[in-house]
């Protein structure tokens, strides 16, 4: 029997740590190769609120498996250690909790949205990426445990959240709620009404969660969120009913009440008398068979557009419906129109509508070169949105700090890295994308004439980051382009 | 470390069982004493949501099944099986299943077991069929106390320590599996190319050798669904598990006279949780890998897994760069037409 | 329960100018266009146009452009219609309906303008 | 702009007549047509939306039909209360225009 708060407790977590310490460090070569690798492992099992138990006593039966290795015995006798120790310093926290043996919840697994890509990691004894991972999950998972039982005496007034609200256009979902933390951290959970509750957003100090990949899968659901709040560095303290604080959200119906996006003309062409408008259709994050499905596919006939129609000289406005994505109206030969679209879905009570597409005029260029460059970062925003539910661990060559007499060599780069993206995804709306944003941005860059830049690092040169960096550093410089236009 | 660290640790974290196996905690349910509505049972779920690590590594499950004239309570604990728990010597305690057996207590019908494997004390068996047999039998019924006053009988002794500690083929600890074990269900899983299981027990199956198994059964009245942990070495419904090397479930139709019989195998954890009927599966062996990729010039590249849809990545030799706007990923897909699997070709280009 | 009430009827000289209300209650204002139809006596409904109370947009039969101006108060779920210049055949019930895109489904009780010298 | 012809201009028929208006549109709306009901000094009511949807609360004797450029409105079983005028209106594109009505009188 081991006192955690005493002498036990110092010993278990310093050797735990230092044995931790120890086998990262003879790892530290391990890395290079393991790029964001997402192992079956760590989707099913989380240190999650209340199952910290169940995570560290799973993780220490899988750091056994690594003991035949046919490595150093220093190695060997550290990872038993680490894995031994784990184990019974479990059951002392079990007992400074004031619990039985550590409670571990339902052996439930969580599950995964991405398919098992038969990655049998438990089988693979040079898997040396897994264990690394493994090591940094049970130190932080540890930390997080030990941080909380050194501050159980202090105080533990939390602060309910309140003003939940649920923040959905195109159905990428967000609660958020308010206050901002001091001294305490949140965990959001969601459920349908018949459904289990999930946890989302861990501990954070946000006041804002992406909710997302849990309403997608069922967008005709009725969803229910609650926001819990523990005390900073204490989470396994509870409010005086000894359960931790929380806060119920209104309902939510993705399909009825997430908001219409902004509609976007994707092109119009005039034959005569008649001008065919079509409107693009948006991508959401709504999934099926492994593709992204557009507004269209989700909503079907309840999705109607309204354009407005004028002509360039004049204000009087006109306006036609469709329960497709094209328009075909009559014009005056001659003259040039412009427009501007509204998404409505009619069976609606709140919500109906959109706000107004931008306008579109003929006779000139679709929205000149700016507009063109407005286009390419909600082109580059929609394909973070779409990688998201992805796991593509490309790191791509990005330059962070354009100087703005390489902006155009540096835009070439992200062009070109661009495409690794459309090859790894595999996936038909970010090709699409992809396409149709080098194309606005290729229009842009000629527009400039062929501009020699000398001095400027090859893109093979730049650092190579994550796509999540990629992006941002694209967004600047396409900003940058769009203040010097 | 600190010398007198270093031997606490050395000296008190690890336990050994007789053949110097390094022993490790066991999981039990852990709710104490609860009411309960078990009666006239062949066996009873405990219905106790509480997984717990217990203490000591020595320490076994137990379960403690009580009626008198006002209730029945079921109380569920960890306990080291050297002490005597409610004044009875745990006689039982290496079995695998919790089989109860009843002991003499004034004023009430008391029955008790206890039992090693993970959450064993989640399943109370009062059955007389398994009160009689062999506790090493096959078949997994396992389990049976033999008396001998609380030490194990030597050969008891020697399979619980071979069965404890299994290795696969390269020597790697083997640890029990997590399946689905809902047994059989009723389900509305039809015409679809696969079907969640939608059972909520996750267990840990009692021997590391055992893989996930899903059984799909239609007849004219209704359609039902078997999930549970079994011996591959072992048939199931008469049939071999041919699949159970495989990481999905991928069902396949037998032949069953009077019903419509599908049944898969697995060895991931939860595998039987996802059942796949879909064609594309059936006709290809779930064990496909592929062979070593092509060389990529100036390009090396380290496989950790050569299963189908693993992605992989060559990596630029030094002194080398991966040109920009290509990638460096293969991915292990199936060529349909032959049933063969392949790497793809990369669109790599490494330059100095 | 949703309800439009119009206000009463105006008698008008020519020349004038008449601005009729439309009050929309239970239901979101700016979730539905407002519509305004005429009905000259005896005769059929005649569409003047629409305002959309989300973005302010108005859209006009041509033979009511300059005749009539639609507006909205969004504080107080109102919508208006002022006609100018009024002239004897102007004399009609002018009613507003709420629009769901594919119909009028709620209408107003109708407001009778009558221009007479 | 769409011309909507509606025919016949007045139609006389008894209670538990089956009667058919029809709505031509001068170009393709699709099915974006809706039929209305007026009692004399009433507001208009809405019977028929999406030319074959029947609107909330309206007694299924009533019943829309056709797409493109002809539409019909038909009662299968007239009722005392069924006498008024009934209008069409294409809602496609402003402006969004009725038909100049059919008046159903009791024979």
């Known amino acids: 029997d081991c006192d955690i708060e005493g002498k036990d407790g110092k010993q278990y977590e310093s050797v735990l740590m230092v044995s931790i310490d120890q086998l990262l460090d003879s790892m530290k070569e391990i890395g290079s190769n393991c790029l964001n690798n997402e192992f079956n492992f760590f989707k099913r099992h989380i240190c999650d609120a209340n199952k910290e138990g169940m995570f560290l006593f799973r993780a220490a039966r899988k750091l056994r498996q690594f003991l035949k290795m046919n490595s150093t015995g220093d190695f060997d006798l550290h990872l038993l250690k680490v894995s031994e120790g784990t184990t019974i310093l479990l059951n002392c926290t079990g007992q400074v909790k004031g619990r039985k043996p550590a409670a571990l919840g339902e052996a439930q697994p969580t599950k995964s949205l991405e398919e098992n890509k038969s990655l049998k990691e438990q089988k693979k004894l040079n898997d040396l990426c897994f264990l690394k991972r493994l090591l940094q999950e049970i130190k932080t998972c540890w930390n997080k445990i030990l941080m909380g039982t050194k501050e159980h005496s202090g105080t533990t007034n939390t602060v309910a959240a309140y003003n939940l609200t649920w923040k959905s256009t195109n159905f990428k979902t967000i609660l958020e709620w308010e206050p901002k933390p001091v001294n305490q951290v949140y965990t959001v959970q969601i459920s349908t009404k018949s459904g289990d509750w999930k946890s989302k957003c861990f501990y954070t100090t946000d006041t804002e969660c992406d909710l997302t990949d849990e309403i997608v899968k069922d967008v005709k659901q009725t969803y229910l969120a609650r926001v819990f709040s523990y005390p900073a560095g204490n989470v396994e303290s509870t409010g005086s009913a000894g359960e931790p604080l929380y806060e119920n959200s209104p309902e939510f119906t993705p399909y009825l009440e997430t908001n219409l996006g902004q509609p976007t003309i994707q092109s119009f062409e005039q034959v005569g008398t008649k001008v065919n408008v079509t409107v693009e259709d948006e991508r959401t994050l709504v999934r099926r068979n492994n593709t992204f499905l557009s507004l269209r596919d989700v909503f079907g006939k309840d999705l109607i557009y309204t354009l407005y129609y004028w002509k360039s000289s004049s204000s009087g406005k006109k306006t036609a419906k469709t329960n497709t994505n094209e328009f075909l109206i009559d014009v005056d030969k001659g003259e040039n129109y412009c427009f501007s679209v509204q998404a409505v879905i009619p069976s609606r009570t709140v919500n109906r509508k959109s706000t107004d597409s931008p306008v579109e005029c003929m006779g000139q260029e679709k929205g000149e070169f700016r507009e063109n460059w407005v286009n390419v970062i909600s082109d580059l925003k929609k394909i973070e949105d779409l990688i998201q539910s992805m796991h593509i661990d490309a790191t791509l060559y990005t330059e962070s700090d354009v100087h703005p007499s390489c902006k155009v060599t540096a835009m070439k780069c992200f062009l070109l890295e661009l495409q690794v993206i459309s090859l790894e995804s595999g996936d038909a709306s970010i090709h699409d994308t992809v396409e149709n944003l080098i194309i606005l941005a290729n229009n842009s860059l000629s527009s400039n004439g062929n501009v020699t830049e000398s001095g400027c690092k090859e893109c093979e040169e730049l650092e190579e980051k994550n796509i999540k960096e990629f992006l941002q550093s694209f967004v600047h410089i396409v900003q940058m382009f769009i203040n010097t236009s | 470390i600190p010398p007198h660290v270093q031997k606490s640790v050395n000296n008190d974290m690890i336990v050994t069982d007789n053949n110097g196996a390094v022993k490790f905690p066991q999981l039990c349910k852990f709710c104490d004493v609860r009411f309960s509505t078990c009666d006239n049972q062949k066996s009873c779920m405990s219905n106790c949501s509480i997984t717990s690590i217990c203490e000591k590594p020595q320490e076994v499950c137990v379960a403690v099944w009580r009626k008198n004239d006002e209730n029945i309570t079921l109380e569920t604990v960890c306990h080291d099986p050297k002490l005597p728990y409610h004044d009875f010597i745990l006689e039982d305690a290496a079995s695998p299943k919790c089989i109860m057996k009843e002991k003499k207590k004034p004023g009430e019908t008391f029955f008790m077991c206890s039992c090693s494997s993970d959450e064993c004390n989640d399943n109370i068996i009062f059955s007389e069929e398994y009160n009689t047999s062999n506790p090493d039998g096959g078949g997994g019924s396992g389990g049976g106390g033999s008396g001998g006053g609380g030490s194990i009988p030597p050969h008891v002794q020697k399979s619980v320590n071979n069965d404890m500690i299994v290795t696969d083929n390269n020597g790697a600890v083997k640890f029990p599996q997590l399946c689905k074990f809902c047994d059989v269900r009723f389900s509305t899983c039809d015409n679809q190319k696969s079907c969640m299981s939608n059972c909520s027990i996750t267990s840990i199956c009692e021997k590391p050798q055992e893989v996930c198994v899903a059984v799909w059964r239609k007849n004219d009245e209704n359609i039902t669904l078997e999930t549970v942990c079994h011996d591959p070495k072992l048939p199931y419904h008469d049939f071999i598990l041919e699949d159970a090397a495989s990481p999905k479930c991928i069902m396949k139709e037998k032949k069953k006279p009077g019903e419509t019989f599908f049944m898969c195998s697995c060895s991931s954890d939860e595998c039987n949780d996802n059942i796949i009927f879909s064609e594309e599966y059936n006709t290809s062996n779930p064990d496909i890998t592929c062979p070593p990729p092509m060389s990529v010039e100036h390009a090396d590249i380290w496989v950790k897994s050569y299963s189908l849809y693993s992605r992989e990545r060559y990596i630029c030799n030094s002194g080398f760069k991966r040109k920009a706007g290509t990638s460096s990923l293969t991915e292990c897909v199936l060529n349909k037409a032959t049933n063969v699997a392949h790497w793809t070709t990369p669109s790599l280009k490494c330059i100095r | 329960q949703i309800q439009l009430v119009q206000s009463g009827g105006e008698v008008k000289k020519p020349g004038a100018s008449v601005r009729v209300s439309c009050k929309a209650s239970?239901?979101?204002?700016?979730?539905?266009?407002v519509y305004w139809v005429r009905q000259s006596p005896g005769k059929g409904l005649e569409w003047i146009g629409y305002?959309?109370?989300?973005?302010?947009?108005?859209i006009y039969d041509q033979n009511f452009k300059g005749k009539a101006t639609l507006t909205v108060d969004k504080s107080t779920s109102t919508a208006y219609m002022e006609l100018s210049s009024l002239r004897s055949e102007d004399t009609a019930v002018y009613f507003c309906?709420?629009?769901?895109?594919?119909?009028?489904?709620?209408w107003g009780q109708g407001t009778t303008v009558t221009v007479s010298s | 702009d769409i011309q909507m012809t509606q025919s016949p201009a007045s139609l006389s028929a008894s209670v538990g007549d089956r009667v058919t208006i029809t709505c031509l549109a001068s170009?393709?709306?699709?099915?974006?047509l809706a039929w209305y009901l007026q009692k004399p000094g009433k507001s208009p009511q809405l019977l028929i939306y999406?030319?074959?949807n029947l609107a909330d609360g309206v007694p299924s004797r009533f019943s829309g039909s056709g797409s493109g450029t002809d539409f019909s409105f038909t009662i299968s079983s007239l009722q005392p209360e069924d006498f008024a005028t009934y209008y069409c209106?294409?809602?496609?594109?402003?402006?969004?225009?009725f038909g100049q009505g059919t008046k159903l009188e009791i024979k």
């Open positions: 999406a030319a074959t």
């Open positions: 309906a709420r629009d769901v895109t594919t119909a009028l489904d709620f």
């Open positions: 305002i959309d109370p989300y973005n302010g947009i108005t």
């Open positions: 209106q294409q809602v496609y594109s402003s402006p969004f225009t």
């Open positions: 239970g239901y979101s204002f700016t979730d539905y266009n």
């Open positions: 170009q393709t709306i699709d099915t974006w």
